[in-house]
């Protein structure tokens, strides 16, 4: 028998520095977690102790903090090289800055192979990107070789900016021939490494003949066997075992997100490459693991540029940006409109001639807007200003909801109106009218939404049975502020870009902004 240790990360999302337990900015260092310096300590410890070790990343290193905003992926290549990753799969967020923003900082600079079997380049891009990412890699480990096949969410064109010269094929259809090639090469130990979410990971384990292990990402899935060490609630045991269609037991793993855990899976193979046993658990990278001094010093060196960046002007406002709780928790506020407009702008994807855009709606809990921005400072808006407005380090995500769920959400928005509570919704692409004289749960008297399947966008009444795409904070997608109906009833959830980054990009693009209060949210006569 031959034993392989798979160390894995996914959805690190720019958390190069240690973070608090909830993966936001580290405040009390003695209680902070993750970060590449701490990760390196643990990886090196395992490499020294065990003979056959692979360090893999399942995508979405890009996007999430000011590190990515400033360094645009160069930081990913640099620190992943320093940690000596063996391979990485492309995630959807790797395309956030377009194909060029992937090629130059990461594909050309990474010292490790970057994989995806289901992304096919065409046109002029084909020759430019040739060899910079691969469908599979044969990695020599000890006296054996291990095949790694990569995959990426086929939803990427709706979630990011891959452009028109990359085709995202069905994962299973694309993976099978590559696995067959590896088998032809007498590579009999094969890992599928990719970024399509836990449901697809399980399908790959079930359907792709010859895959021995699946290491996934995208859905931030936390798996654990035994008592979990932190706040995350396991979605199943680690590894999660799937019985394949040809009767094999295939371990599937994921390691939550944000570099908080290091996935640790030990696999025992027989001489024919069959999995005999698999066991392990994610390792919580808490403060009991010291940060590696040399990596930490490098982080501190790179940090300097971030501090300079946060005070630079992004753009100007010529109006007061009202982000006060007195406004945003009670009525339409222009800060809410600005943020929602930025959220929609960030999700412009012309992927179908029938649709002017794939999504037109935004909802945003007023309680998530934490500060106004005064225009009387020469109109200057900085990253620092935006960090005061959006201090939680969240993301603006894409969900699919039925109209009936949206209706419930808007009822929840005003179910206890008047108490300055955070659930009051700011909107974009939505016109809502409330009648507060009616009983809670029946206060939405009009709810019109902007069409997407139209050449001239207009507002139409919400249809209860129709499925709509909506951009919202991850906080709401996870049921925050009492929006349990969103969490329970959402049909799809894809995590998006860092909230501050979305707004800062929009302001930089617009240069001068002047958001108004324009009647998106109204109260019917006599009730307010």
């Amino acid at each position: 028998a031959w034993e392989l240790t798979i160390l894995h990360t996914n959805d690190v999302h720019s958390r190069l520095e240690q973070t608090s337990e909830d993966s936001s900015k580290c405040v009390n260092a003695s209680r902070c977690m993750g970060g590449v310096a701490r990760l390196f300590t643990k990886v090196q410890q395992i490499r020294r102790a065990e003979p056959n070790v692979l360090l893999l990343d399942a995508g979405d290193q890009y996007q999430g903090t000011i590190w990515f905003t400033v360094y645009k992926g160069a930081e990913v290549a640099h620190f992943m090289n320093a940690l000596r990753y063996d391979a990485m799969a492309l995630g959807n967020h790797e395309f956030d800055n377009g194909v060029e923003g992937l090629i130059e900082p990461l594909l050309k600079e990474a010292k490790f192979p970057i994989l995806s079997a289901n992304i096919k380049a065409k046109g002029p891009l084909a020759s430019q990107i040739s060899g910079l990412y691969l469908p599979y890699k044969v990695l020599p480990v000890g006296d054996e070789v291990v095949g790694i096949v990569g995959y990426t969410s086929k939803e990427t064109p709706f979630l990011s900016n891959p452009g028109t010269n990359l085709v995202f094929e069905d994962e299973i259809t694309a993976l099978q021939p590559e696995v067959d090639k590896l088998k032809t090469l007498n590579v009999n130990k094969i890992i599928a490494l990719g970024h399509s979410g836990f449901e697809m990971d399980k399908l790959i384990a079930q359907k792709v003949r010859g895959v021995d292990v699946v290491v996934g990402g995208h859905s931030n899935t936390f798996l654990y066997t035994g008592n979990p060490p932190s706040k995350e609630v396991p979605a199943g045991k680690y590894p999660f075992i799937v019985t394949s269609d040809d009767g094999r037991k295939v371990p599937v793993v994921q390691a939550y997100a944000f570099g908080k855990y290091l996935g640790y899976l030990k696999i025992e193979f027989d001489e024919r490459g069959n999995v005999i046993s698999s066991h392990g658990n994610p390792i919580l990278l808490n403060s009991s693991i010291p940060e590696d001094p040399s990596i930490k010093a490098d982080i501190n060196k790179w940090r300097i540029k971030l501090d300079n960046y946060s005070t630079q002007e992004l753009g100007k406002t010529i109006v007061y940006l009202d982000g006060s709780s007195q406004s945003c928790r009670f009525r339409e506020c222009n800060m809410g409109n600005l943020i929602c407009d930025a959220m929609i702008n960030n999700n412009l994807r012309h992927t179908d001639e029938m649709f002017w855009n794939h999504v037109s709606m935004c909802i945003l809990n007023g309680g998530g807007i934490r500060s106004p921005i005064d225009e009387r400072n020469n109109g200057t808006i900085t990253w620092e200003n935006l960090a005061a407005v959006l201090p939680f380090g969240g993301t603006f995500d894409l969900v699919q909801l039925k109209g009936s769920t949206l209706k419930k959400a808007f009822e929840h928005s005003v179910h206890r109106y008047g108490q300055s509570t955070g659930e009051f919704l700011q909107v974009g692409g939505i016109h809502v009218v409330y009648d507060l004289s009616r009983k809670p749960g029946d206060r939405v008297v009009k709810l019109d939404v902007l069409c997407t399947k139209c050449r001239v966008p207009s507002y139409d009444p919400l249809k209860m049975d129709e499925v709509y795409k909506v951009i919202l904070p991850n906080f709401l997608a996870n049921g925050g502020d009492g929006f349990q109906m969103i969490k329970d009833e959402l049909l799809r959830h894809d995590s998006g870009d860092q909230d501050i980054n979305v707004v800062s990009t929009y302001i930089s693009k617009m240069k001068v902004i002047y958001p108004a209060v324009e009647g998106r949210i109204k109260f019917s006569t006599g009730s307010h």
């Epitope: 050309k108 600079e109 490790f112 060899g131 599979y136 990695l139 020599p140 090639k181 032809t184 090469l185």
Partner: antibody, heavy 119, light 107 residues
Amino acid sequence: QVQLQQSGAEVKKPGASVKVSCKASGYTFTRYYIYWVRQRPGQGLEWIGWIYPGNFNTKYNEKFKGRATLTADTSASTAYMELSSLTSEDTAVYYCARDVYDYAGFAYWGQGTLVTVSS
Amino acid sequence: DIQLTQSPSFLSASVGDRVTITCKASQGVATAVAWYQQKPGQSPKLLIYWASTRHTGVPDRFSGSGSGTEFTLTISSLQPEDFATYYCQQYSSYPWTFGQGTKVEIK
């Protein structure tokens, strides 16, 4: 563009060793295997082995095991092939090569290094 | 070791001719076969890999087929620059091996 530049011709005595270098450019050296192949005068091609500069693992043709040593210097993006206990049978052009997809054919070749073993 | 036997060893042909070279493996190699062209004093050049996939920049008059033990390289219309020696190679089992070569000469 991908280029593999090999060291110059060598004349060696029987029993000696030779070390041929192969400097890679135009791609990330650590991400691709380097293969070594030789061609004796007027003969066909013979695979010697490979090295993966990403972790320095090697694989040899049994025929050359113990005599051939493949190494790499990642800081210089250079691979080396050393052959010891030379005999006249080792007189050949030695090539380094790189693939597009692992193992699947040698897509890029060095210009070759002629090693002559003669007393 | 897997033996690869090419036939013919020598082939005389004219410009415009359709030329077929075969490569037989002593045991099955699925589709793990590559074809190379080599001109005197030059390094070999990859034409085909995975038995039938043309390498970037290789003219479409070159095609490969076969699987298991029998493989074919076809040049649909021989051009003056195609006169060279052609080798097949298997990369299914160690040690990787080459055929003895087929020299295509001008008639």
